[in-house]
């Protein structure tokens, strides 16, 4: 059984602030590159996905993340903090279309959640959200 | 209901876990009115970077 998935849960919504990711020469790619495919490893920060007239899922480019100091980390300099957030939306029903970013339900919910987080964390430090995943409650 | 899991990125030193959760909880009422999203069971934790897909996905119960 072969196949691969779309870059489903890789969404970065950002508010225009920038920070820079530094990589060592050993890195295969920057940690914030946009994947064309992914299987079960949505570890990248990508951009907000939108439906386009060209009938494809479009990923706009992401400003690089910035930081004043360089670190010895092979993947990312210090300068960025990540938080895992989980919550229930009790007045919505899960269905299988929430497993696929090309569906209207997925895109509408993702858009609302993305906008909501931009409202909540308006302060300058917020860089964005990524790895969004929906599952039944 | 729908469970939403995601990762938030902030410039280092601008916010901590407690504040991420507090600000999110304070917004829940507005989220209900503005986006018609009734939010509950909020959970926030630190993610060491580079975070693996495994660590991301296995936070749920």
């Amino acid at each position: 059984a072969s196949g691969s998935a779309s870059g489903s849960a890789s969404t970065l919504v950002h508010n225009g602030t920038s920070a820079r990711a530094t990589t060592t020469p050993a890195s295969k790619s920057t940690p914030f590159s946009i994947p064309s495919h992914h299987s079960d490893t949505p570890t990248t920060l990508a951009s907000h996905s939108t439906k386009t007239d060209a009938s494809s899922t479009h990923h706009s480019s992401v400003p690089p993340l910035t930081s004043s100091n360089h670190s010895t980390s092979p993947q990312l300099s210090t300068g960025v903090s990540f938080f895992f957030l989980s919550f229930h939306i009790s007045n919505l029903q899960f269905n299988s279309s929430l497993e696929d970013p090309s569906t209207d339900y997925y895109q509408e919910l993702q858009r609302d959640i993305s906008e909501m987080f931009l409202q909540i964390y308006k302060q300058g430090g917020f860089l964005g959200l990524s790895n969004i995943k929906f599952r039944p409650g | 209901s729908v469970v939403v899991q995601l990762t938030l990125a902030f410039r280092e030193g601008t916010i901590n876990v407690h504040d991420v959760e507090t600000q999110f909880n304070q917004y829940k009422t507005e989220a209900a009115s503005r986006y018609n999203l009734t939010i509950s069971d909020v959970s926030v934790s630190d993610v060491p970077f580079p975070f693996s897909a495994q660590s991301h996905h296995h936070h749920h119960h």
């Epitope: 059984a1 072969s2 196949g3 691969s4 998935a5 779309s6 870059g7 489903s8 849960a9 992914h38 299987s39 079960d40 490893t41 949505p42 439906k51 060209a54 009938s55 494809s56 899922t57 899960f94 269905n95 299988s96 279309s97 497993e99 696929d100 970013p101 090309s102 569906t103 209207d104 995943k133 599952r135 039944p136 | 897909a53 495994q54 996905h57 296995h58 749920h60």
Partner: antibody, heavy 117, light 107 residues
């Protein structure tokens, strides 16, 4: 690489039930959906239903409601499809297809179920 | 239910030929359409997801496009391993439905 391995071929009598398993192997997680699809001889593929592994969430095609039951065993990374009250027209190859960031990303090899008296 | 009308039901072609398969949806499905390949032995593999995105490991000779309610799978230069049956699949609304299939045979 993710692989979906289905149970072996079955021969059943009309009125009986059959339970087909679909085990995910390789680098995988317990939180994803499995769709079940069947293909009768000379017929188009037909969607039967969906289950989100590790939960009791299911969706069924109305055509099969009441006869098909989808279940899963998270610890074994296995999904099951049970079809009851079998009739000759249920003779088909049954496929599972799992999600991985999008629907129907990976497919099992198929399980032939023959219903014959 | 959403009907997918796939054409042609079969075609004969030679290695190197450009092959086009079309699927017409009875209702608006946006970009929620996949293309699948079924080998003669029965194994199914997804080639294209979300109308036009190529799955990893799938050769670039395969492409998907859309014009209104018509969805197209194109094989730019047919290879020996491409002789198989191709299906479109919509997942815009339940029950998810499939096209009738197109069998690509050697001329």
């Amino acid at each position: 690489e993710v692989q979906l391995v289905q149970s072996g071929a079955e021969v059943k009598k009309p009125g009986a039930s059959v339970k087909v398993s679909c085990k995910a192997s390789g680098y995988t997680f317990t939180s994803y959906g499995i769709n079940w699809v069947r293909q009768a001889p000379g017929q188009r593929l037909e969607w039967m239903g969906y289950i989100y592994l590790g939960s009791d969430y299911t969706e069924y095609n109305e055509k099969f409601k009441g006869r098909v039951t989808l279940t899963s065993d998270t610890s074994a990374s296995t999904a099951y499809m049970e079809l009851s009250s079998l009739r000759s027209e249920d003779t088909a190859v049954y496929y599972c297809a799992r999600s991985a960031g999008s629907l129907f990303a990976y497919w099992g090899q198929g399980t032939l179920v023959t219903v014959s008296s | 239910d959403i009907q997918l009308t796939q054409s042609p039901s079969s075609l004969s072609a030679s290695v190197g030929d450009r092959v086009t398969i079309t699927c017409r949806a009875s209702q608006d499905i946006g970009i929620t359409l996949n293309w699948l390949q079924q080998e003669p032995g029965g194994a199914i593999k997804r080639l294209i997801y979300a109308t036009s995105s190529l799955d990893s490991g799938v050769p670039k000779r395969f492409s998907g496009s859309r014009s209104g309610s018509d969805y197209t799978l194109t094989i730019s230069s047919l290879q020996p391993e491409d002789f198989a049956t191709y299906y479109c699949l919509q997942y815009a609304s339940s029950p998810y439905t499939f096209g009738g299939g197109t069998k690509v045979e050697i001329k």
